[in-house]
């Protein structure tokens, strides 16, 4: 039975040209996290394997930095970066947990962070 929950940074906004940290946290389970995948819509940005470490897609290596922790930092943001991002936790023995973050990249300088929320 899957008992865990993923807490994410929720709906967030950031300025064009700036950077943002995408963060997820898995709690309420004793399952072993074997890998975390970061995806944007249908594209795989990066993986972080518990043993082998980070592996960043060459398509994104110039604008994506690993961490902090299991999070992902997006740099040199453009309006095209607006959209859904997913953290996918592969765990043993529970299986897969998925968290969702919506990022809005704004032209203006009044970007504010949204509230944190949980996905069961």
């Amino acid at each position: 039975m899957m008992t865990g929950t993923i807490e994410t940074t929720g709906n967030i906004s950031a300025e064009k040209g700036g950077s943002i940290i995408l963060q997820c946290h898995l709690s309420s389970t004793t399952a072993q996290v074997t890998q975390v995948n970061w995806e944007q819509q249908d594209q795989l940005l990066a993986i972080c394997n518990a043993d082998l470490g980070w592996h960043i897609s060459p398509s994104f290596k110039d604008r994506v930095a690993p961490g902090p922790g299991l999070g992902l930092t997006l740099q040199s943001l453009t309006v095209n970066d607006t959209g859904e991002y997913f953290c996918i936790y592969h765990t043993y023995p529970d299986g897969t947990y998925t968290g969702r973050i919506f990022l809005e990249v704004l032209e203006s300088s009044v970007a504010e962070h949204g509230a944190r929320f949980q996905i069961p």
Epitope: D42, I47, N49, A50, D51, G53
Partner: antibody, heavy 114, light 107 residues
Amino acid sequence: EVQLVESGGGLVQPGGSLRLSCAASGFTFSSYGMSWVRQAPGKGLELVATIKSDGGSTNLPDSVKGRFTISRDNSKNTLYLQMNSLRAEDTAVYYCVRGYFDYWGQGTTVTVSS
Amino acid sequence: DIVMTQSHKFMSTSVGDRVSITCKASQDVKTAVAWYQQKPGQSPKLLIYWSSTRHTGVPDRFTGSRSLTDHTLTISSVQAEDLALYYCQQYYSTPYTFGGGTKLELK
């Protein structure tokens, strides 16, 4: 030049034990996760163990869990695979592999037979 | 576990031919796919990672591509030294799994 040199293979009876070693050179060993991958005669490839760069985390599939142990000594630039309670189906060439499988050793052969 | 199926155990080709080796994933693994070449008596060597990126020193006649769950390694003009076993691998989900291999041989 990245070099991975395995040793320790041989013929062992079912139920016996072996310890494989992999001597690494040509890169900063302590910065890389490492793996053991095996290839049974005439068969495909199977990942049998992975270990974090600092040795603090390991992962083994159910087929070898409880029988095999992966470890490393970063001061000696060496990776190990301790294999206990060996079975005929463990007969294979065992390869030491760096990181995300970018460099492989030449392999060492383990034969489990009575 | 994700199953990577290489439906052709053998493929016959001639020097200079274009050949495509296919691998089908049992579920979507996005671009987390690598390809390896193994010559007789040797260890596997990484050719392609992240579906389409060539590893250091790999000739540009080797290209990788993806269409949903179908992954393809193409050799644009086969050379004699390309006759070997080819394996795909997924690293989208643990445990990482390999295809059964495709042996490229001369007609």
